[in-house]
């Protein structure tokens, strides 16, 4: 949950292609204003997905979700809450 | 803003070596199946997607990383 | 035109410090891995580093880690090499080269810049 | 770290000889090889990637085999302009080591 909450458009087209959803890519790319190449690119990326099966996509995601809520994320988290905390304050 | 092991990850996947990416994975998971599965996933990136491919791929994190949503 | 172009070589003295720069033009500068690789005089080629598109990840060859740091600025199309604590064996022509997305090699080359280390 | 060992240097041959020169890396590396081909007094070249494949613009006399720890750089016929020094470099991943060189001259 907290990962998502660093960059969710990131997580949204993330898992689009993990997923292997295409509608669901689309739609996440439209967010962002993709032009046609770059939604070509996403969509050889998603292929590879769609490929190698479930247990591929399973397996990544894994990975992903291990990375972002890790130490070297949530650190950078927990410093980023202390920054906002601190010109909250100083800004009233 | 995204965590920079994260970008870290992903510029790996897209314009580091498959040992290079697989090396970063291992990082964070070292079972043998999720790093087979990771190589088997960059080598099929690099078997798919051409030079502009991959620029593309990369303009489009960019409008990622900058946009509002993130 | 694909170019890279290198400049801050220079005559120093040992334990000395330099920075070297490298202007690209002609390409998405951003998202290209750019190498640092030397040649001594009358000697073969030598990798020293490597920095990714957004500085995620960097290497050093051993023999120049801790002393040597690459960095670069996108905004400039500008890539760097601060080195300090220079000594002799660091002598020679410096040259900055892209690395390609698609096969991971060296394919355009600037003209090299010279540093001398000597007292 | 991965060494990689370049042969022969320095190597003399006459115009319209087949030359071969090889790279052994220590361990394995997939086809990650690249040769680089540096005229006296100028910048080096990209000529042969992946160990096999030939790079945009360059010669088809120039041709690159191998995979694995043994890799060979073959000129089919030497012409007066190939005099250079010629590197191999394996690219699997950092460090991205060449081999010290094959100085190659014309008898």
């Known amino acids: 949950v907290k990962m998502a909450e660093t960059c969710p458009i990131f997580y949204d087209v993330f898992f689009a292609v993990a997923n292997g959803n295409e509608l669901l890519l689309d739609l996440s790319l439209t967010k962002v204003n993709a032009t046609e190449p770059e939604r070509t690119a996403m969509k050889k990326i998603q292929d590879c997905y769609v490929e190698n099966g479930l247990i591929s996509r399973v397996l990544d995601g894994l990975v992903m979700t291990t990375i972002s809520s890790s130490k070297d994320c949530m650190g950078e988290a927990v410093q980023n809450t202390v920054e906002d905390l601190k010109l909250n304050t100083l800004g009233r | 803003e995204i965590c920079p092991a994260v970008k870290r990850d992903v510029d790996l996947f897209l314009t580091g070596t498959p040992d290079e990416y697989v090396e970063q994975v291992a990082q964070y998971k070292a079972l043998p199946v999720v790093l087979e599965n990771a190589r088997i996933l960059k080598n099929c990136v690099d078997a798919k997607m051409t030079e502009e491919d991959k620029e593309n791929a990369l303009s489009l994190l960019d409008k990622i990383y900058t946009s509002p949503l993130c | 035109e694909v170019q890279l172009v290198e400049s801050g070589g220079g005559l120093v003295k040992p334990g000395g410090s330099l920075r070297l720069s490298c202007a690209a033009s002609?390409?998405?500068?951003?998202?290209?891995?750019i190498n640092w690789v030397r040649q001594a005089p009358g000697k073969g080629l030598e990798w020293v580093s490597l920095?990714?598109?957004?500085?995620?990840?960097?290497y050093y060859a051993d023999s120049v880690k801790g002393r040597f740091t690459v960095s670069r600025d996108n905004a400039k199309n500008s890539l760097y090499l601060q080195m300090n604590s220079l000594r002799a064996e660091d002598t020679a022509v410096y040259y900055c080269?892209?690395?390609?997305?698609?096969?991971?090699?060296?394919?355009?080359w600037g003209q090299g810049t010279t540093v001398t280390v000597s007292s | 770290d991965i060494q990689v060992t370049q042969s022969p240097s320095p190597l003399s041959a006459s115009v319209g000889d087949r030359v071969t020169i090889t790279c052994r890396a220590s361990?394995?590396?997939?086809?990650?090889l690249a040769w680089y081909q540096q005229k006296p007094g100028r910048v080096p070249q990209l000529l042969i990637y992946?160990?096999?494949t030939l790079q945009s613009g360059v010669p088809s006399r120039f041709s690159g085999s191998g995979s694995g720890t043994d890799f060979t750089l073959t000129i089919s016929s030497l012409q007066p302009e190939d005099v250079a020094t010629y590197y191999c470099?394996?690219?699997?991943?950092?460090?991205?080591?060449f081999g010290q060189g094959t100085k190659l001259e014309i008898k």
């Open positions: 361990q394995g590396i997939s086809n990650y």
């Open positions: 002609g390409f998405t500068f951003r998202n290209y891995n």
């Open positions: 470099q394996k690219y699997n991943s950092a460090p991205y080591t």
């Open positions: 080269a892209r690395r390609t997305l698609s096969y991971y090699v060296m394919d355009v």
């Open positions: 992946a160990a096999s």
């Open positions: 920095i990714s598109g957004s500085s995620s990840y960097i």
